[in-house]
């Protein structure tokens, strides 16, 4: 059997928002499902589709989904149909409409005291609720003369009046929203007694010193008053000028002149008729004096040929709104052709070099006129004047790659050394025309540089090798004093190098010949056994052809090397008591001993009373504390070696003796006593 | 206007079973889908399962599903849950609610049943 | 099953105030672009209120001053100006699929 799982159900849905029927079947075989809209088949549109077998509605509509839905799940094989519950959309609307007349049956027979309905023509689901407005005032039940229906949609007016003009507008609302009139109906009923107004005052700006006219007529019978108020309700009259309005003139038409007009002048002016019957009929206009900003600046532009460019002219703040126009050498630019303004903008299509140079944005209105220039540069592709060369530098000395450019606007130059770029250090210079220096050239400089020189137009670029000319040097320089251990094997190395390979030889600095126990080996001096006359000055010599000879001399010392004669030992202290470290050296030169206590060197000058360093090199430390516990170092050095060696030092508590332990007991560890 | 009736308690003993009642009035009994909601205290509510008044259609909650029975008498217009093997673990409140069978919301509920499992 | 997280679990609002309860679901309940998100609200003693149906349509009879919103997986009811009447539990529960299941609910107090 087919079963319903979910079934469409008739629900409350808006006009225009989304909507769902639901439909779910479960049955043994395969199911057809579709849909009937009053019996007849649902085709699927954009707004209307089946999703799975449910209905989807993306926007209902009133009129195309008014009826019965019905879900209908059919088995093509058995022929067995099922068909869900019915269900039907409440849909919500509201739709604006007129404001027409509905009696009498046109405009031209609406006369004082006759009566007057209105209709409103907004209609919608469910019932809307009517307000009636007029001169956007809303109306209420029987108010001045009126019937209105605020359920209906009529209003009516018994008996008619000329009170009773103006604009009359409606609004409706019900659950969907709410809707006003698309159209209102001005309501105009005469009385000649009324003020009517035949010459309204326009707003007017004025530069100053200049005059303004204010033109106002009424008409009615009889005759009605004019009268000209200014902004603090000031009456205006021939007689009787406020101290700021001196020079204004009423004239007997009703317009009103005012000369030399002043910034005190501005503000709001009415005119106010009034007739016999009636309320008074108030016209306003403004008088604004003319003004005009200054321009903001242009930034000097940059155009490469060829391309189209646009520049915007900001016209300045003013009143009233400035005319703007573009002006080249004095000429005013046209509105058409390569070269020509559109709107506040001048453009430039297609552009050449010949269209550099500066041009003028003009403003101006009543209050005067700005200008402002900008200066457009066409920029053109580099050319060159050098071009990098293939260059030979010598060590150690400045050395020069050129890269001489022309172009507009002035190009920037950058270079390139083993196609990473060159940022200016302490060791490479830029020059403003291009040139590269590098400063105490290295041997490692020699490699590829490009130099890359551009504008916004393009860029051009080359590349050059350098090749270094090594200097004679000595690689490294040998350390000009050295030491040798006596009765052992030594070795002074010398090395050099140029732009040839060096020959490396070493002689004695008297001249004297190396003895035969002394051989010198591809520049290293070898001593088999070192005595005590082989110390002594040794001149290492590097020559080769192009660049002659350079010479270092050592010193060659021999000495004993250091040994400890006596180290410290691990040391434990009472308190109070006396430490001493113990510590001898012995070399040749005969070593100096220094201690470091707690990671700092003792200085025997700033040791204090309670620490002395002996003549043999022992360390004392009376009355100790137990901040002095730690490693103490001791270092034994001469002008050819240096040696160290540490030991601990604790301090603890004396121990209270127990009654039990005789006067001869021993501590509970190895310690000294003082 | 729509009313569900539901008993105010049932008292019955572990092991043995219960059938819960909800008369509805005020619509078409047939056309709403009947709901049945489980509530203890400091548990929460918990959605038993559904039945189709008209063609007598069921779903469950899988977790009730071997425990309850839906039936409906359509001349009374009454639906029917059935508890088997009760214990103390099936004491709650139980509510019949009627069932939008489109968005199926729950817009009207019975006052509920106080059942109570205990020896 | 999809698991509905509701919060705060309690809530003190001021009479006159806005309250908000959020609930969130452990996987889209959206379908054929709807949202179903029910909420409903109890009192002790009585049996849960319908107020809102999928997801922003508001329950019959039920005040202006509540209001829902949300899609996918997040949820809101908004209950705006609260009143002296709105102390209750506040209910989520969603109608996508079997079996409908329902938020642990949040207790709504004057402040």
């Known amino acids: 059997a087919i079963v319903f799982i979910k079934q469409p159900s008739s629900q409350d849905a808006l006009q225009g928002r989304r909507a769902l029927l639901r439909c779910e079947v479960e049955a043994p075989g395969l199911v057809h499902v579709y849909w009937l809209l009053d019996g007849a088949p649902v085709q699927d549109t954009e707004r209307r589709f089946t999703q799975g077998s449910s209905l989807s509605f993306a926007a209902v509509d009133r009129l195309q989904d008014s009826g019965t839905f019905q879900c209908v799940a059919r088995d093509d094989v058995t022929g067995e149909e099922a068909r869900s519950a019915n269900a039907s959309f409440n849909i919500k609307w509201i739709e604006a409409g007129p404001v027409v007349l509905k009696h009498p049956a046109s405009e031209a027979e609406i006369q004082p005291q006759t009566q007057v309905t209105l209709r409103c023509h907004i209609d919608g689901h469910p019932r809307p609720t009517y307000q009636w407005f007029r001169d956007g005032t809303p109306l209420s039940d029987g108010q001045s003369n009126n019937t209105v229906s605020s359920k209906e949609r009529n209003l009516t007016l018994r008996p008619a009046g000329p009170e009773h003009s103006g604009l009359y507008s409606c609004c409706a609302h019900n659950a969907f929203g709410q809707a006003c009139s698309s159209q209102n109906f001005t309501l105009s009923i005469a009385d000649e007694s009324f003020a009517r107004v035949v010459l309204a005052p326009q707003d007017v700006i004025v530069a100053r010193n200049e005059e303004a006219m204010f033109h106002c007529q009424f008409s009615a019978q009889p005759p009605p008053n004019l009268q000209w108020l200014f902004e603090d309700e000031t009456p205006i009259t021939n007689r009787s000028r406020p101290p700021h309005l001196r020079r204004a003139t009423v004239f007997a038409n009703g317009s009103l002149l005012l000369t030399q007009v002043r910034p005190r002048n501005a503000g709001v002016y009415r005119c106010i008729g009034q007739g016999q019957r009636g309320p008074p009929v108030i016209l306003e206009a403004t008088l604004h004096l003319a003004e005009i900003e200054d321009m903001p600046l242009f930034e000097p532009r940059v155009f490469t040929a060829g391309s189209e460019e646009r520049v915007t002219c900001l016209p300045p703040k003013g009143l009233p709104e400035p005319s703007v126009w573009w002006e080249h050498a004095g000429v005013r630019l046209p509105t058409h052709g390569r070269v020509y303004q559109k709107g506040h903008e001048l453009v430039l299509a297609s552009i050449a070099e010949s269209d550099a140079g500066v041009y003028t944005c003009h403003a101006a209105n009543l209050a005067g006129q700005r200008r402002q220039d900008v200066n457009i540069t066409v920029a053109t592709v580099p050319t060159w004047l050098k071009k990098p060369q293939d260059s030979q530098l010598e060590e150690g000395k400045p050395g020069y790659l050129h890269c001489l450019t022309q172009a507009t606007p002035k190009p920037t130059v950058v270079w390139y050394r083993n196609q990473m770029l060159i940022s200016e250090d302490s060791r490479f210079e830029v020059f403003k025309n291009g040139t590269l220096r590098i400063n105490n050239v290295e041997v490692y400089d020699g490699t590829w540089y490009r130099c890359v020189s551009s504008t916004p137009a393009g860029s051009i670029e080359a590349q050059a090798r350098v090749q270094v000319l090594e200097k004679l040097k000595f690689t490294p320089p040998p350390q000009p004093q050295q030491c040798m251990e006596f009765d052992k094997e030594a070795t002074v190395p010398c090395s050099a190098t140029g732009r040839e390979k060096p020959t490396i030889k070493w002689e004695r600095a008297d001249g004297s010949s190396l003895p035969e126990w002394v051989t010198d080996n591809a520049g290293t001096l070898h001593f088999a056994r070192v005595t005590r006359d082989d110390a002594g000055n040794y001149t290492c010599i590097a020559s080769n052809g192009p660049q002659g000879q350079i010479r270092a001399h050592v010193q060659l010392t021999v000495a004993v090397f250091i040994t400890f004669k006596v180290e410290p030992e691990r040391t434990t202290v009472y308190q109070g008591h006396t430490a001493l470290l113990q510590c001898e050296a012995q070399g040749d030169p005969k070593p100096l001993i220094q201690w470091k206590g707690k990671d700092r060197i003792l200085d025997p000058t700033k040791l204090g009373p309670r620490m002395h360093i002996f003549q043999n090199g022992s360390l004392v430390i009376h009355d100790v504390a137990p901040e002095d516990s730690g490693r103490y170092t001791c270092i034994a050095g001469n002008s050819c070696n240096i040696k160290h060696t540490e030991a601990p030092l604790y301090v603890v508590d004396k121990p209270v003796p127990e009654e039990s332990e005789g006067p001869g007991s021993p501590p509970p560890y190895k310690m000294i006593q003082t | 206007q729509v009313q569900l009736q539901q008993p105010g308690a049932e008292l019955v003993k572990p092991g043995a079973s219960v059938k819960l009642s909800c008369r509805a009035s005020g619509y078409t009994f047939t056309t709403y889908w009947m709901h049945w909601v489980k509530q203890r205290p400091g548990r929460g509510l918990e959605w038993i399962g559904w039945i189709d008044p008209n063609s007598g259609t069921t779903k469950y909650n899988e977790k009730f599903k071997s425990k309850t029975t839906l039936t409906v008498d359509k001349p009374s217009s009454t639906a029917y849950m059935q508890l088997n093997s009760l214990t103390s673990e099936d004491s709650a409140v139980y509510y019949c609610?009627?069932?939008?069978?489109?968005?199926?919301?729950?817009?009207?509920w019975g006052q509920g049943t106080t059942l109570t499992v205990s020896s | 099953d999809i698991v509905l997280t509701q919060s705060p679990a309690s809530l003190a609002v001021s009479l006159g105030q806005r309250a908000t309860i959020s609930c969130r679901a452990s996987?889209?309940?959206?379908?054929?672009?709807?949202?179903?998100m029910n909420w409903f609200q109890q009192k002790p003693g009585q049996p849960p209120k319908l107020l809102i149906y999928?997801?922003?349509n508001q329950g019959s009879g039920v005040p202006a001053r509540f209001s829902g919103s949300g899609s996918g997986t997040d949820f809101s009811l908004n209950i705006h100006p609260m009143e002296e009447d709105d102390t209750a539990m506040y209910f989520c529960q969603q109608s996508k699929e079997v079996p409908f299941t329902f938020g642990s609910g949040t207790k709504l107090e004057i402040k």
């Open positions: 999928a997801a922003s």
């Open positions: 609610a009627r069932g939008d069978s489109n968005y199926d919301y729950f817009d009207y």
């Open positions: 996987e889209s309940v959206d379908n054929y672009g709807i949202s179903f």
